[in-house]
Interface confidence: low
């Protein structure tokens, strides 16, 4: 059923031990109850118990309190299950009967075995709270409480919403008091069948089959499936869509494995030389003064260029070179002379001529001789 009307009998008082007719019970009124629950009637009248009926065993004699879940085969509270939307209104008839023997069937009892009969009607909402009531007649008093609650898996104001919590392939949810689904953490969707992927998992490129998972579609990788997978064999390149190979700066070719920037990647030029890329794996080094070689790896001797004049001898030094001038000459390269024509500086028949610019004289050499003093024989 979708719900149950519960009636809790608490106390019945029949101090004189008499029937409704006023006749006393012998030896006392062995009391049991019949309960009839039906649709709302402005005036409760006999007729079918449309919502159900229930009887108790003998619960006591004359006056007695009724224990919860009383023994003797009865149950307290009494249960009247129903299998329809609770209408919110009802009529209730409670009859107290005397049982002279053990047979409690209606046809086995004399009509005058009735002790008392009460009838109530009204509105009753579904809820956990008990409504306490007491009905008194001239001879008897009955104290009881009642309520309507939904059966397991039924919810809502009228017990009309069926909801069974589950955690399996068909859904992952519990039920709220109104019968709506409340998804377990990690699940979403109308029936909580759709897992919530790992936070940040890319909407298009990732998916999941269980919560907090992020599985990548082909061509994507990474914890959140937001990194594309480049072309297989891509060496120095990246991608913005799967299977691309966009070369990093300085690289070329289908797989970005051709070095277009040898200078930057390998720094081949030595001794402060300037490097210029000149094609794939090709470069040119421009050497600083004093260096030579493909990579400017060789140091030049500055004396190799014979910088000293007038027979001066050249000496290499850390910071360059130094000319040792013969007597009568001076200057960085022994280019200045302290002699004049009067000193007969020209050898091998050379004729001397006075000069004023820089040097004091100049020798004009005969054939087969050269040098500033005609001191060198030409072969």
């Amino acid at each position: 059923g979708s719900g149950v009307f519960q009636l809790q009998l608490q106390e019945f008082i029949n101090e004189r031990g008499v029937l409704a007719s006023g006749r006393p019970c012998e030896p006392g009124c062995r009391t049991f109850f019949r309960v009839c629950l039906k649709h709302f009637q402005a005036v409760v009248s006999p007729g079918p118990c449309t919502f159900g009926t229930v009887s108790t065993p003998v619960l006591g004699t004359n006056s007695f309190a009724v224990r919860d879940d009383s023994s003797g085969g009865g149950r307290n509270p009494l249960q009247l299950p129903f299998n329809f939307t609770w209408p919110g209104t009802f009529s209730l008839i409670i009859e107290a009967w005397h049982a002279p023997g053990d047979d409690l069937r209606p046809e086995a009892l004399p009509p005058d075995a009735l002790i008392s009969k009460i009838a109530i009607q009204g509105s009753l909402a579904v809820g956990q709270n008990w409504l306490l009531d007491e009905q008194t007649s001239t001879l008897t008093r009955l104290r009881y409480s009642y309520r309507v609650i939904c059966s397991d898996n039924y919810y809502g104001d009228n017990c009309s919403r069926l909801c069974k919590k589950r955690n399996d392939h068909f859904g992952h949810y519990v039920c709220q008091p109104d019968g709506n689904l409340s998804c377990l953490p990690g699940w979403t969707g109308e029936y909580c069948q759709q897992p919530i992927c790992l936070s940040g998992c890319h909407e298009q490129n990732g998916y999941c089959s269980k919560p907090a998972e992020c599985l990548c579609r082909p061509g994507w990788q990474g914890r959140l499936c937001n990194e594309c997978i480049p072309h297989n064999g891509c060496r120095h390149g990246t991608c913005s869509t799967p299977w691309q190979c966009t070369c990093d700066e300085g690289w070329g070719g289908l797989f970005c494995d051709q070095d277009l920037n040898y200078c930057t990647h390998h720094s081949p030029c030595k001794n402060g030389a300037t490097c210029s890329n000149s094609g794939q794996r090709s470069y040119t080094c421009t050497c600083r003064p004093g260096y030579t070689g493909v990579d400017c790896e060789l140091e030049l001797s500055e004396c190799d260029s014979n910088p000293c004049r007038n027979g001066g001898s050249c000496k290499d030094q850390e910071d360059g070179y130094h000319c040792l001038c013969p007597p009568g000459y001076y200057g960085l390269h022994c280019e200045h002379s302290t002699l004049s024509c009067a000193d007969s500086p020209c050898f091998n028949g050379g004729s001397c001529r006075e000069r004023n610019q820089g040097a004091n004289y100049a020798c004009e050499c005969p054939p087969n001789f050269t040098g500033s003093n005609c001191e060198k024989k030409v072969d």
Epitope: N167, D168, H172, S182, L184, P185, G186, W187, K210
Partner: antibody, heavy 118, light 107 residues
Framework: EVQLVESGGGLVQPGGSLRLSCAAS????????ISWVRQAPGKGLEWVGV????????DYADSVKGRFTISADTSKNTAYLQMNSLRAEDTAVYYC???????????WGQGTLVTVSS | DIQMTQSPSSLSASVGDRVTITCRAS??????VAWYQQKPGKAPKLLIY???FLYSGVPSRFSGSGSGTDFTLTISSLQPEDFATYYC?????????FGQGTKVEIK
């Protein structure tokens, strides 16, 4: 690092009450369910109940329904187990555990012993 | 409630042995089964979830299999640190229920 730390266990007389706490850290408290699982001395594991700290939804084992109440304080990242009408058979080590999305318990506290005896 | 029945309740084995523990559910639980390891005085540790998935950080010598009502936990080569009590658990329906445990002892 995910951590669950229980406290509040001790000796209590039958019919008495006790409140256990489970302090959680290292994960988003409101995104996970927290279960209580108990283990009587020398016995196996028994699920007690569960709470969704985000919504307050709870569920209980039949053996404790009506006596035990699970609650949570999301500002303190702490779950509680309020135990009333305690019986001798409630004597056990009580663990709180993170109830993973699939209903598995992937992180457990160290446990706290509750002894019900007169 | 769904009953989970483990067998054997205890076993003796040596280091290097292959060990198999079985668990039977009283009704179909699909693959909603987990396995735990517990050592004396300690909390249980999750080993396997969804019947066959190895939980992170758990050595690969542990494996799980099964679906429906019959499930198995296998330790391919028993190590000294594996001597403990093992529990199965179903999470197919509430309440989640555990097996009674299998104690693995040193032979």
């Amino acid at each position: 690092e995910v951590q669950l730390v229980e406290s509040g266990g001790g000796l209590v007389q039958p019919g008495g009450s006790l409140r256990l706490s489970c302090a959680a850290s290292g994960f988003t408290f409101t995104d996970n369910w927290i279960s209580w699982v108990r283990q009587a001395p020398g016995k196996g594991l028994e699920w007690v109940g569960v709470i969704n700290p985000n919504s307050g939804s709870t569920d209980y084992a039949d053996s404790v329904k009506g006596r035990f109440t699970i609650s949570a304080d999301t500002s303190k990242n702490t779950a509680y187990l309020q135990m009333n009408s305690l019986r001798a058979e409630d004597t056990a080590v009580y663990y709180c555990a993170r109830d993973n999305f699939g209903g598995y318990f992937d992180y457990w506290g160290q446990g706290t012993l509750v002894t019900v005896s007169s | 409630d769904i009953q989970m029945t483990q067998s054997p309740s205890s076993l003796s084995a040596s280091v290097g042995d292959r060990v198999t523990i079985t668990c039977r559910a009283s009704q179909d639980v699909s693959t909603a089964v987990a396995w735990y390891q517990q050592k004396p005085g300690k909390a249980p540790k999750l080993l396997i979830y969804s019947a066959s998935f190895l939980y992170s950080g758990v050595p690969s010598r542990f494996s799980g299999s099964g679906s429906g009502t019959d499930f198995t936990l296998t330790i391919s080569s028993l190590q000294p640190e594996d001597f403990a009590t093992y529990y199965c658990q179903q999470s197919y329906t509430t309440p989640p229920t555990f097996g009674q445990g299998t104690k693995v002892e040193i032979k």
